[in-house]
Amino acid sequence: SPVPFGPEGRLEDKLHKPKATQTEVKPSVRFNLRTSKDPEHEGCYLSVGHSQPLEDCSFNMTAKTFFIIHGWTMSGIFENWLHKLVSALHTREKDANVVVVDWLPLAHQLYTDAVNNTRVVGHSIARMLDWLQEKDDFSLGNVHLIGYSLGAHVAGYAGNFVKGTVGRITGLDPAGPMFEGADIHKRLSPDDADFVDVLHTYTRSFGLSIGIQMPVGHIDIYPNGGDFQPGCGLNDVLGSIAYGTITEVVKCEHERAVHLFVDSLVNQDKPSFAFQCTDSNRFKKGICLSCRKNRCNSIGYNAKKMRNKRNSKMYLKTRAGMPFRVYHYQMKIHVFSYKNMGEIEPTFYVTLYGTNADSQTLPLEIVERIEQNATNTFLVYTEEDLGDLLKIQLTWEGASQSWYNLWKEFRSYLSQPRNPGRELNIRRIRVKSGETQRKLTFCTEDPENTSISPGRELWFRKCRDGWRMKNETSPTVELP
């Protein structure tokens, strides 16, 4: 059970002053320099004012230095995401210093007490960084603080208190409770480092949001809208856990931010791209797949530094597991006529055929409604790289899949029993790849046959490169 330390106000100098008892009080924050990928290697403990461990453990003053900061804990032992992250950093940056900030004594508390302790821990990290800065060749610009959950706000405090500016802070699903809407000096914020990038994976607009919903960095990335992560649904989790609980779902979605970051370290050749967008709904409509004016970026470790005047909210879809990368496509379908549509929205599916592979049958999510005599935009994504697209099959699903649609159909039938066949006409589909920024136009195979109705399909072949528009820059060109 957690040790009953009080909140920050009563901690005062417990960190460094010995109590007047026979046992000396140890500092509540330790810095463990991980010298090996092997989790069983004990590493070295660094402490302010003691230079010997730096020499003994070959601390590289000119290399990058990562500080990994855990969050609230119920167990008092480091969870395995930390081991994975340490390993991935060692794999990717072989000469780097990887320091685990152990604040378990202050994190293994009631959540409210742990929150109150974040400031003290931030101060300890800042003191360590100030001391390291006194050494020749150590540069704060080479420091990258990586904080998960409550640890993200600890990183914010550290960046705020240090003399100078740290190079980068990555917030991995920063904690929401007690931080949502807080003043910028009481949470992670863009002024805490030269570059602050954030991954949000467990935000909820209803109920308790474990992760913070508001943007808190220079770039704030919301994979899968920042809420429901693939592979973390009750079905997925309970399917693999004999006695699973909702806690497993929470852990899966909250921790997904860490695994996305790990993925960016170890699968450098499969970078995931996020696209700037004002909100999740617009992204779901496929409106936001542009890379112009820094509107797209790699996620995780490979993110390119962007210091916007305003927070930049970015979105992407991902797979359910590593590698998380998917391929995003914007599909623009111009519906030029519309017959007897009734009340219900059609259910469309597309299959994309490419030079490398063909996609599965992909649903077109209708975010609002199909507009006639207008261009309707959709987002589709595939797990595999299809190569250059060659043709598209558009299918209008026949039988209704939902009770709601069945009811609407029945109501439509009652009001218009002899409702003639529903139909709409589509001449072309314009497609833009998010990953390559390439634009293509697909035309119906038979120019005379442009109509589609329930249970029918329509085939489109590539008929033009581009949309007769100026080319946009490709994110793949900008890979580091």
Epitope: S1, G76, I77, F78, N80, L82, D102
Partner: antibody
Framework: QVQLVQSGAEVKKPGASVKVSCKAS????????IHWVRQAPGQGLEWMGH????????NNNEKFKDRVTMTRDTSISTAYMELSRLRSDDTAVYYC?????????????WGQGTTVTVSS | DIQMTQSPSSLSASVGDRVTITCRAS??????LNWYQQKPGKAPKLLIY???KLHSGVPSRFSGSGSGTDFTLTISSLQPEDFATYYC?????????FGQGTKLEIK
């Protein structure tokens, strides 16, 4: 070399409590966690819980939640496990084991075991 | 809790034989699988951790493999001192759980 030395065998009556000690040497006591694992006669191994000696934080298996208390004395590098309200099915060999800082770390060194017999 | 199931429960083999013991987890344990050897009246000893890493001082005839939910411990050429009970243990999720054990007996 790393060593964990446990206290001697105990015979207890049902309803009583037993406190087993585990003295560590050969490494920095506060750098690893100490776990308690028991083994009933002819049975397998069952994890009971752990203590982080650095600050005394504990986490127990739900099965023993309200009956087990883990403490430590860093001045003598010793961990303790107290099991209360003993029943006959608590008759087992109780082991302390050292574990690294992660969930994934194995139990790399074990005490020799303490036999606890619960009998009326 | 994650259930760990070992098979077989017991097996008889001769010195020099190659022996394989399997361990199945009730869910993916991310390769956080450790193997221990226990002799009668003694404490368990760590053999292999993180699926395939050999603990210091353990002979190279012991090896581990597997991923996801299925893991194996292999002894390439049995020696007289290898007759014991072997346990697998998952380090993925609390509470830590062990397999029921596999007793390796001399034929």
């Amino acid at each position: 070399q790393v060593q964990l030395v446990q206290s001697g065998a105990e015979v207890k009556k049902p309803g009583a409590s037993v406190k087993v000690s585990c003295k560590a040497s050969g490494y920095t006591f506060t750098d690893n966690t100490i776990h308690w694992v028991r083994q009933a006669p002819g049975q397998g191994l069952e994890w009971m819980g752990h203590i982080n000696p650095y600050y005394g934080g504990t986490n127990n298996n739900e099965k023993f939640k309200d009956r087990v208390t883990m403490t430590r004395d860093t001045s003598i590098s010793t961990a303790y496990m107290e099991l209360s309200r003993l029943r006959s099915d608590d008759t087992a060999v109780y082991y302390c084991a050292r574990k690294g800082i992660y969930y994934s770390s194995p139990f790399d060194y074990w005490g020799q075991g303490t036999t606890v017999t619960v009998s009326s | 809790d994650i259930q760990m199931t070992q098979s077989p429960s017991s097996l008889s083999a001769s010195v020099g034989d190659r022996v394989t013991i399997t361990c199945r987890a009730s869910q993916d344990i991310n390769n956080y699988l450790n193997w221990y050897q226990q002799k009668p009246g003694k404490a368990p000893k760590l053999l292999i951790y993180y699926t395939s890493k050999l603990h210091s001082g353990v002979p190279s005839r012991f090896s581990g493999s597997g991923s996801g939910t299925d893991f194996t411990l292999t002894i390439s050429s049995l020696q007289p001192e290898d007759f014991a009970t072997y346990y697998c243990q998952q380090g993925n999720t609390l509470p830590f759980t062990f397999g029921q054990g596999t007793k390796l007996e001399i034929k």
